[in-house]
Interface confidence: low
Amino acid sequence: VPRWRQQWSGPGTTKRFPETVLARCVKYTEIHPEMRHVDCQSVWDAFKGAFISKHPCNITEEDYQPLMKLGTQTVPCNKILLWSRIKDLAHQFTQVQRDMFTLEDTLLGYLADDLTWCGEFNTSKINYQSCPDWRKDCSNNPVSVFWKTVSRRFAEAACDVVHVMLNGSRSKIFDKNSTFGSVEVHNLQPEKVQTLEAWVIHGGREDSRDLCQDPTIKELESIISKRNIQFSCKNIYRPDKFLQCVKNPEDSSCTSEI
């Protein structure tokens, strides 16, 4: 008789999850000399240990501590780019501006980007059928707790001027419930961080509004100011031109507003 299995509301573990994590780890350590010391088998064992045999609604940050320890990485604290609801452009930017880093440019972020995973209580099986959805099932699921943990650590490491890329096409440009709004904003360290600079990315070519005056941006400014961190905001009217000007800042067309 087949054993009863919990049906969750979210998609199951990404197929070939163990192989994907291991392959990504090998690839990352090959191309980042400063991480060449990392033993990818140990990284996978620590990752697995965080959720295998545990109830997928009862995962804690402590479960991920062995993985966090193995994945400890120093990125230049003044070169951090946070993002919310605009991952692709943020990643394009760090590919061009190669001395800046998103969370997904670090080993742990790179390993887990776009993947889903969960286990089952008291069995060593990975659940490929379904995993808990953050809203419909529970927030303390393996994926959500992982991103909360690494995002907190990433924000805590930031210093000087921290940049955040926000999606100006969304109804809530700054969303208090996003990872940026609920975790990263609150873990920037006022002793180290002087300024949070928001880049609001416009979607439409004809959109000339000042989205820095948006009520949700004002809300972000208020939260940041209360934490004794300065806030500044820039409209990026032309994201395509913005990337081009990052690559070729001396281009004559880059002196005008982007």
Partner: antibody, heavy 119, light 106 residues
Framework: QVQLQQSGAELAKPGASVKMSCKAS????????MNWIKQRPGQGLEWIGY????????EYNQKFKDKATLTADKSSGTAYMQLSSLTSEDSAVYYC????????????WGQGTSVTVSS | QIVLTQSPALMSASPGEKVTMTCSAS?????MYWYQQKPRSSPKPWIY???NLASGVPARFSGSGSGTSYSLTISSMEAEDAATYYC?????????FGGGTKLELK
């Protein structure tokens, strides 16, 4: 300035092997991936694979897995590609090109090595 | 593997004419890259990350697109633009090129 200098044309018999070279200069050899691309006469481009010289890590297009072997010599700043069990299908120009792993495109290319397989 | 289909395979344009060529991917890719190749020469990087011009590429060139549909546009054709243009994707191994669009001067 950056240069990728490839070895001269090769004429080989079916079943034989050839090993071509790509000498890099003007940049830090170990900081970039080295790609190899095939172009048959009058045809398009086909990616064979890359090597990361700092660690000798390679990744291949499955199609060329048993055909091409990529190596690199850090001390001389030279990448190599060996092609084995040659057939007429392997007659082509082979380019090496460097790739900065976080973005851009393959930004510098060698002049190409022509391989002719004929009995 | 992701197949990139370029169209048209061959086209001609007069000086000053606007030119658009397309590259269609068999499944979604994150970004598209374009290379220019002239006879008896190595390919040159032309556009990266879909819309960014490589160093030295004239501003009359532009790139756009997302998902499975990408294009390269020349706002005003010049004689030196006659060449074959290849699109290429890095999203999935094997990294693949399109079959090329040969652009001739009319």
């Amino acid at each position: 300035q950056v240069q990728l200098q490839q070895s001269g044309a090769e004429l080989a018999k079916p079943g034989a092997s050839v090993k071509m070279s790509c000498k890099a200069s003007g940049y830090t050899f170990t900081n970039y991936w080295m790609n190899w691309i095939k172009q048959r006469p009058g045809q398009g481009l086909e990616w064979i694979g890359y090597i990361i010289p700092s660690t000798d890590y390679t990744e291949y297009n499955q199609k060329f897995k048993d055909k091409a072997t990529l190596t690199a010599d850090k001390s001389s700043g030279t990448a190599y590609m060996q092609l084995s069990s040659l057939t007429s299908e392997d007659s082509a120009v082979y380019y090496c090109s460097r790739y900065p792993y976080r973005g851009y495109a393959m930004d510098y290319w060698g002049q190409g090595t022509s391989v002719t397989v004929s009995s | 593997q992701i197949v990139l289909t370029q169209s048209p395979a061959l086209m001609s344009a007069s000086p000053g004419e606007k030119v658009t060529m397309t590259c269609s991917a068999s499944s979604s890719v994150s970004y598209m890259y374009w290379y220019q190749q002239k006879p008896r020469s190595s390919p040159k990087p032309w556009i990266y990350l879909t819309s960014n011009l490589a160093s030295g590429v004239p501003a009359r060139f532009s790139g756009s697109g997302s998902g499975t549909s990408y294009s390269l546009t020349i706002s005003s054709m010049e004689a030196e633009d006659a060449a074959t243009y290849y699109c290429q994707q890095w999203s999935t191994n094997p990294w693949t090129f399109g079959g090329g669009t040969k652009l001739e001067l009319k």
